[in-house]
Interface confidence: low
């Protein structure tokens, strides 16, 4: 057992051009808080997958209001460390996600609103008990500077927090067969309960007599590296040429346990220890029920009709997703017609209509063409709050009073020449091009004739000529 500790040093604009706008303003003061999510191993997991090693949330930082005209500085941070306790062995390799959240303190309906400002992720190797590791991560135009470490909680010690230390019973020496506990020389290593010979650095146990391996190690005593680059010959691992001990594929290789489950070898196969909410041979079945409160944001949980859907979340207005976890951008459905501006007020949607339109969704078109005339046989078209003329051929301008030059827009592609004509325009194409606007090459591959297939390609194979 132990604690992963994260210290945020700064969060602000990164170097280089394109400094981000301050997330806070005089009208909308805000404050930051951070969330860290830890997962064992080096697997590239989705941000939504469980934080199997644990997660923590910081306190909220001081309220910040942008000074008008000033660039976004480093933003004021919450006090203290983020601490993620871990109950089992420290895995040595881990993935992290650190999120910077903004809490808006302005005139929010129903209390403060919060939104994700930046998310950084990484994969690291880290021994417990070591010094603070420093890191800089960038997310878009933002930069996050932080330090982290893993430390064991007494009586655990070691790089994986798996060795146990107890205070000495006698002042001078430890009991028979027990060594002093480095670096705590005044303490003694507790009696070994793991399988005899289990590697103290790469193995650990939770039950007497077992030996479970940290990531990257295998074998009954966790003494065999899963793969060592020095053991790789051009044709793959070969113990004969290099003297390396090459393990056969183990049942836990590639971790068959889904959803953050941990794998342990059994005499015949493997066994998955699943995190809460999952079960099945490979932790592939979600056992979450309404009792686990899976619905966010006030979603109402109802037991599912079949075993594969243990619950269904009925989301309140403004939220969606299987767990009501996504705030609906109701304006993304573009409910305002005719170019109206959509405003999501939380409790309601509003449309701000352009001139010439009215109604809750700007659906009513006020009559723009009344009393308007288009010259030279043009017809008036309503729309956008201002009349528009659709002009007859050869005329243009707002009221169709101007003679149009159909060649002014250079409509002929690839060097074709344009000629005005009573019926519109005509393009005279350059050699090698054809079409009403000279848009088509006569030979699409750019050659005058298709060449023979290059050596090694059979006729009918896909070909690309550069």
């Amino acid at each position: 057992a132990g604690v992963f500790e994260l210290q945020i040093h700064s969060f602000g604009p990164g170097p280089g051009p394109g400094a981000p706008r301050s997330p806070c303003s005089a009208r909308l003061p805000c404050r930051l808080f951070f969330r860290v999510c830890l997962k064992p191993g080096l697997s590239e997991e989705a941000a939504e997958s469980p934080c199997a090693l644990g997660a923590a949330l910081s306190a909220r930082g001081p309220v910040y209001t942008e000074q008008p005209g000033a660039p976004a500085p480093d933003l004021p941070l919450p006090d203290g460390l983020l601490q993620v306790p871990f109950r089992d062995a420290w895995p040595g390799t881990f993935s992290f996600i650190i999120e910077t959240w903004r809490e808006e303190l302005g005139d929010q309906i129903g209390g403060p609103a919060w939104s994700l400002l930046a998310r950084v992720a990484g994969r690291r190797r880290l021994a417990a008990g070591g010094p603070w590791a420093r890191d800089i991560q960038r997310a878009g135009a933002w930069e996050l500077r932080f330090s982290y470490r893993a430390r064991c909680e007494p009586p655990a010690v070691g790089t994986a927090c798996t060795r146990l230390c107890r205070p000495r019973s006698a002042p001078s020496r430890c009991g028979p067969g027990l060594r002093p506990c480095a670096p705590l020389e005044d303490e003694c290593e507790a009696p070994l309960v793991c399988r005899a010979g289990c590697s103290p650095e790469h193995g650990f146990c939770e039950q007497p007599g077992e030996c479970r391996c940290l990531e990257g190690w295998t074998g009954p005593l966790c003494t065999v590296p899963v793969s060592t680059s020095s053991c790789l010959s051009p044709r793959g691992p070969s113990s004969a040429t290099t003297g390396c001990l090459v393990p056969g594929p183990g049942p836990c290789d590639g971790n068959p346990c889904a959803n953050g489950g941990s794998c342990s070898e059994t005499p015949r196969s493997f066994e998955c220890t699943c995190p809460r909410g999952f079960y099945g041979l490979r932790c592939e079945v979600s056992g979450v029920t309404c009792a686990d409160g899976p619905c966010f944001n006030g979603g109402l949980c109802v037991g599912g009709a079949d075993p594969d859907s243990a619950y269904i979340c009925h989301c309140p207005p403004g939220f969606q997703g299987s767990n009501c976890e996504k705030r609906v951008d109701r304006c993304s459905l573009q409910p305002c017609r005719n170019g109206g501006l959509c405003l999501d007020l939380g409790h309601a949607l509003r449309c701000r209509c352009r001139a010439g339109f009215a109604g809750p969704r700007c659906e009513h078109d006020l009559d723009d063409c009344a009393g308007r005339a288009c010259a030279n046989g043009g017809t008036c078209v309503e729309g956008g709050g201002a009349h528009r003329c659709s002009c007859a051929l050869g005329f243009g301008g707002r009221d169709c009073r101007e003679r149009a030059d159909p060649c002014a827009a250079r409509p002929c592609a690839h060097g074709g020449r344009c000629y005005a004509h009573f019926s519109g325009l005509v393009c005279a194409c350059a050699p090698g091009y054809m079409g009403a606007r000279c848009e088509f090459p006569v030979h699409p591959d750019g050659a005058s004739a298709l060449p023979a297939a290059p050596p090694g390609l059979r006729p009918g194979d896909p070909q690309r000529y550069l």
Partner: nanobody
């Protein structure tokens, strides 16, 4: 694990009222969806009421019109005002905080409604 501290349970006559309180750490309160669940003897835990960080509320059909959930952001506390209590409201009432993919539970407070 975040500590959620419930209080306010007890023994009450049918038709009476109780007010349950649940205090949560300030670091999560303002962003958590807070809920009350109950578990009657021999039954599954069920949702009673939920209030989101935006203060929108949801209630189980069986308590609509009788129970009211509210939150005091200054005190980091969520309340469940229970009026017109019935014997079937008897059970252990659990406070619940949901934020990100975390779900934290209180220890529970016993509510007994006698007829």
């Amino acid at each position: 694990q975040v500590q959620l501290q419930e209080s306010g349970g007890g023994l009450v006559q049918a038709g009476g009222s109780l007010r349950l309180s649940c205090a949560a750490p300030g670091s999560i309160f303002s962003i958590a969806s807070m809920g009350w669940y109950r578990q009657a003897p021999g039954k599954q835990r069920e949702l009673v009421a939920v209030i989101t960080s935006f203060s929108s509320t949801n209630y189980a059909d069986s308590v609509k019109g009788r129970f009211t959930i509210s939150r005091d952001n200054a005190k980091n506390t969520v309340y469940l005002q229970m009026n017109s209590l019935k014997p079937e409201d008897t059970g252990v009432y659990y406070c619940n905080a949901r934020y990100f993919e975390r779900t934290d539970w209180g220890q529970g407070t016993q509510v007994t409604v006698s007829s």
